[in-house]
């Protein structure tokens, strides 16, 4: 039975040209995390594999940095980066957990971070 929950940074906003940390956290389970995929709609940004390290998609290699931890840092933000991001946790023995983050990239200099929230 899958007992875990994914906690994410929720709905967040950031300034154009700036950077943002996409972060998810898996709690309430003793399952072992074997891999985390970071995806934007149907595009792969990066994979963090517990054995192998990081695979950064070449399309994003100049703008994506691994970490902190299992998170992902998105740099040189553009308005086109606005949208949904997913952290997909592959775990043993539970299976797959998915978290969602919505990022809004703003033209203005006022960009406030949304509250953290949980996805069961």
């Amino acid at each position: 039975m899958m007992t875990g929950t994914i906690e994410t940074t929720g709905n967040i906003s950031a300034e154009k040209g700036g950077s943002i940390i996409l972060q998810c956290h898996l709690s309430s389970t003793t399952a072992q995390v074997t891999q985390v995929n970071w995806e934007q709609q149907d595009q792969l940004l990066a994979i963090c594999n517990a054995d192998l390290g990081w695979h950064i998609s070449p399309s994003f290699k100049d703008r994506v940095a691994p970490g902190p931890g299992l998170g992902l840092t998105l740099q040189s933000l553009t308005v086109n980066d606005t949208g949904e991001y997913f952290c997909i946790y592959h775990t043993y023995p539970d299976g797959t957990y998915t978290g969602r983050i919505f990022l809004e990239v703003l033209e203005s200099s006022v960009a406030e971070h949304g509250a953290r929230f949980q996805i069961p």
């Epitope: 891999q35 054995d51 192998l52 695979h55």
Partner: antibody, heavy 127, light 112 residues
């Protein structure tokens, strides 16, 4: 010499789920140097990559099929499997399993070519 | 996804003559680690594909030295220096630098 052998039905009813298994012999699926893939080939057409699994369970699926695909691994049986749901006539194809090499360096990893392939059963979707 | 375009679609070659197949990528396959993950496969009639070349120019174990690969960026080439009867089949290029893995449409090689 590593060999791959697919097993599963040759005929699937429309709307049903295809289940295929790839048995690995002559080597361990637990080797960290490889990823394990499924590829299909429609009659008289080119090759379409379905997705991969690593021995510890990490996967990535082709976005074009991801809503219908599950790839799993059973290290105790030295095999990995494909499930493709909601089958239609457009899913009629030869389904291959294959082994690919992983290059890992300095905290990063990369996917190299597919060096061992199964024989590939033809799967027909028809009632 | 990265689209690979192969030319020509088919090729009819006299035994002993050279052959060349082109594979062009929709975006640069610039390596992240000083390697470019572009490989070549031959699918003989009724059989699964078999790897010939990996990482652009490295011949796989047991592949005859008449096969060679070259290229960088978006343009890659497979050359057969002297075609033999056993070389007939469909040749595919494949990129694995970016997921999903993608294949070229294939080039059918026949003997005249």
């Amino acid at each position: 010499q590593v060999q791959l052998q697919e097993s599963g039905p040759g005929l699937v009813n429309p709307s049903q789920t295809l289940s295929l298994t790839c048995i690995v012999s002559g080597g361990s699926i637990r080797s960290g140097d490889y990823y394990w893939s499924w590829i299909r080939q429609h009659p008289g057409k080119g090759l379409e990559w379905i997705g991969y699994i690593y021995y510890s369970g990490g996967t990535y699926y082709n976005p074009s099929l991801k809503s219908r695909v599950i790839i799993s691994v059973d290290t105790t049986k030295n095999q990995f499997s494909l499930k493709l749901s909601s089958m239609t006539a457009a899913d009629t194809a030869v389904y291959y399993c294959a082994r690919g090499s992983i290059a890992a360096r300095s905290g990063y990893f990369y996917f190299s070519g597919l060096d061992v392939w199964g024989q590939g059963p033809t799967v027909t979707v028809s009632s | 996804e990265i689209v690979l375009t192969q030319t020509p679609l088919s090729l009819s070659v006299t035994p002993g003559q050279p052959a060349s197949i082109s594979c062009k990528s929709s975006q640069s396959l610039l390596p992240s680690d000083a390697k470019t993950y572009l490989s070549w496969y031959l699918q003989k009639p009724g059989l699964p594909p078999q790897v010939l070349i990996y990482e652009v120019s490295n011949r796989f174990s047991g592949v005859p030295d008449r096969f060679s690969g070259s290229g960088s960026g978006t343009d890659f080439t497979l050359k057969i220096s002297r075609v033999e009867a056993e070389d007939v089949g469909v040749y595919y290029c494949m990129q694995s630098i970016q997921l999903p893995l993608t294949f070229g449409g294939g080039t059918k090689v026949e003997i005249k």
